[in-house]
């Protein structure tokens, strides 16, 4: 047979679907690997072929499209399960070919079990919403294409295991769920269950979104350096250990890259001959504000080290800040006691 462009196993698309629910899976070739769509390929005389490898097996086998009630079917570039079964888990391959051309890609499909409270091994999308912002809407995800627009499905929303009825600031509106002036207590998993009829049968789609309430853009600030500060003097004798924490608060900013670094006499620690250790730790508030601490330590400080200029720097998308540590040798004049 002719050579086939094999894109391998596309692990970027680890598709998870719930057991006993409909699933429609598009062949990734047309979305991510080829420059043309299915219609163009089909009109050019190319055929789309599906096959699969069961979980924990090596043998590729054709998909059985002759199951009762057309449980598995193909429509254009979509593989349909109506509904899925647990043992449908495996690696699925779609191959586009004719006598002179061939291209294929495989992808993993995992059929996941859920309990009555929608707990499962499913990875849920995370929707971040700003605290105290006026109105946030989330939409029941990944339900397009399951039923025609003429069908009006019933939609029930849950927070965790509890149906959302008379929640004071959360309002179900069909496929949408609206949050009014959200608070941290609105954090959690929100599940929509969409029920629709097809050929005399009722199908259910279960979709869960994790809501995380985060700091508002109106509260976003440049970094704030808590330590070092002008009130604390690091007074040491040669031979002692010098430990200076650089503690910086970053308000939550969507997609911000928060940075903290030290300079010694204007140079990065890697560029100086001093034997310096830097350890970093990060903690988060309930609204994902970040406190980042970089501890600079010199095991046995020398008189020269005590004359150097130690500066903590911080940067986010709102701006930069810097603060020098007050370091001096013990006995060199009167100063306030060191407090850490």
């Amino acid at each position: 047979s002719e050579r086939c462009d094999d894109w391998g196993l596309d692990t970027m698309r680890q598709i998870q679907v719930f057991e006993d629910e409909p699933a429609r899976i598009k062949c990734p070739l047309f979305e991510h690997f080829l420059k043309y769509n299915y219609s163009t390929a089909h009109s050019s005389g190319l055929t789309l072929i599906w096959y699969w490898t069961r979980q924990d097996r090596d043998l590729e086998e054709p998909i059985n499209f002759r199951l009762p009630e057309n449980r598995i079917s193909k429509e254009k570039d979509v593989l349909w399960f109506r509904p899925t079964l647990l043992n449908d888990t495996g690696n699925y391959t779609c191959m586009l070919r004719n006598t002179t051309y061939c291209s294929k890609v495989a992808f993993p499909l995992e059929v996941v079990q859920k309990d009555s409270c929608f707990n499962s091994a499913m990875r849920f999308p995370v929707h971040k919403m700003y605290i105290e912002h006026g109105i946030h809407k989330i939409t029941c995800p990944n339900v397009d294409g399951y039923f025609p627009s003429s069908v009006k499905p019933s939609v029930t929303w849950y927070k965790g295991c509890t149906e959302i009825v008379d929640f004071h600031n959360v309002l179900p509106e069909g496929m949408n769920l609206s949050f009014f002036i959200p608070l941290v207590s609105n954090n959690g998993n929100y599940t929509c269950v969409v029920t629709y009829p097809e050929n005399g049968r009722l199908f259910h789609l279960t979709r869960t979104v994790t809501v995380k309430v985060v700091g508002s853009p109106k509260d976003a600030l440049p970094p704030q350096i808590y330590s070092p500060n002008d009130r604390v003097v690091y007074e040491k004798e040669p031979g002692e250990e010098l430990v200076i924490p650089c503690k910086v608060y970053f308000s939550f900013i969507m997609d911000s890259h928060n940075e903290v670094w030290w300079t010694i006499d204007g140079k990065k620690p890697d560029d100086v001959t001093v034997d310096i250790t830097i350890n970093e730790s990060v903690s988060y508030s309930s609204t994902e504000d970040e406190t980042r601490t970089q501890i600079l330590s010199i095991k046995k400080v020398t008189p020269e080290d005590l004359r150097r200029n130690y500066v903590c720097h911080a940067r986010n998308t709102k701006g930069e800040a810097e603060q020098a540590a007050k370091v001096k040798q013990k006995g060199n004049g009167c100063t306030e006691p060191m407090t850490l």
Partner: antibody
Framework: EVQLLESGGGLVQPGGSLRLSCAAS????????MSWVRQAPGKGLEWVSA????????LYADSVKGRFTISRDNSKNTLYLQMNSLRAEDTAVYYC???????????WGQGTLVTVSS | EIVMTQSPATLSVSPGERATLSCRAS??????LAWYQQKPGQAPRLLIY???TRATGIPARFSGSGSGTEFTLTISSLQSEDFAVYYC?????????FGQGTKVEIK
């Protein structure tokens, strides 16, 4: 200095309407959620309504839902409460309060008395 | 909605004595609890937020403790100006709700 000054209270008949105003100063009004809280004579405090800092999100106590409307004009640093279909049980001192998700109501106005009586 | 219950309804204390006020939530409010003081004819004043943090300008004799569903406001040594009604309030969930109040009166 943060100041909140309510006005618009008075005597009104059952079924009538009243519009309360709260003039804010001493802080960036447009950056805060604002609320109305009321206190019936000799009784405790009851949150009535809240509005988001930009004015697009509103919430109401069940006791006033459908009758009261909260709004704000950030250009005038003013909070409003439109009260319709007033009942005797709406008689109270109405306070406007700055609302913070991390500290509750940190500043209050002096209040304005609304009396609903025939 | 979350129901806040304060006890006792009235507390009779002599000046200089300690006063302990309790507040219970019908479900967890984490540490999202505030205490207010209200004197006759005046608006409430924020004393404590985050269950235990004193608001600006509040004397150190006022302290708050607790988390979840059980909270306490302690006034370590009552001054004449402390005789008032005290309210707890949760701001964890909408609607924000108040306790019915505790009146601290002179014994």
């Amino acid at each position: 200095e943060v100041q909140l000054l309510e006005s618009g209270g008075g005597l009104v008949q059952p079924g009538g309407s009243l519009r309360l105003s709260c003039a804010a100063s001493g802080f960036t009004f447009s950056a805060y959620t604002m609320s109305w809280v009321r206190q019936a004579p000799g009784k405790g405090l009851e949150w009535v309504s809240a509005i988001s800092y930009e004015g697009d999100g509103t919430l109401y106590a069940d006791s006033v839902k459908g009758r009261f409307t909260i709004s704000r004009d950030n250009s005038k640093n003013t909070l409003y409460l439109q009260m319709n279909s007033l009942r005797a049980e709406d008689t109270a001192v109405y306070y406007c309060a700055r609302s913070l998700y991390w500290s509750g109501f940190d500043y209050w106005g002096q209040g304005t008395l609304v009396t609903v009586s025939s | 909605e979350i129901v806040m219950t304060q006890s006792p309804a009235t507390l009779s204390v002599s000046p200089g004595e300690r006063a302990t006020l309790s507040c219970r939530a019908s479900q967890s409010v984490s540490s999202n609890l505030a205490w207010y003081q209200q004197k006759p004819g005046q608006a409430p004043r924020l004393l404590i937020y985050g269950a235990s943090t004193r608001a600006t300008g509040i004397p150190a004799r006022f302290s708050g403790s607790g988390s979840g569903t059980e909270f306490t406001l302690t006034i370590s040594s009552l001054q004449s100006e402390d005789f008032a009604v005290y309210y707890c309030q949760q701001y964890n969930n909408w609607p924000w709700t108040f306790g019915q109040g505790t009146k601290v009166e002179i014994k």
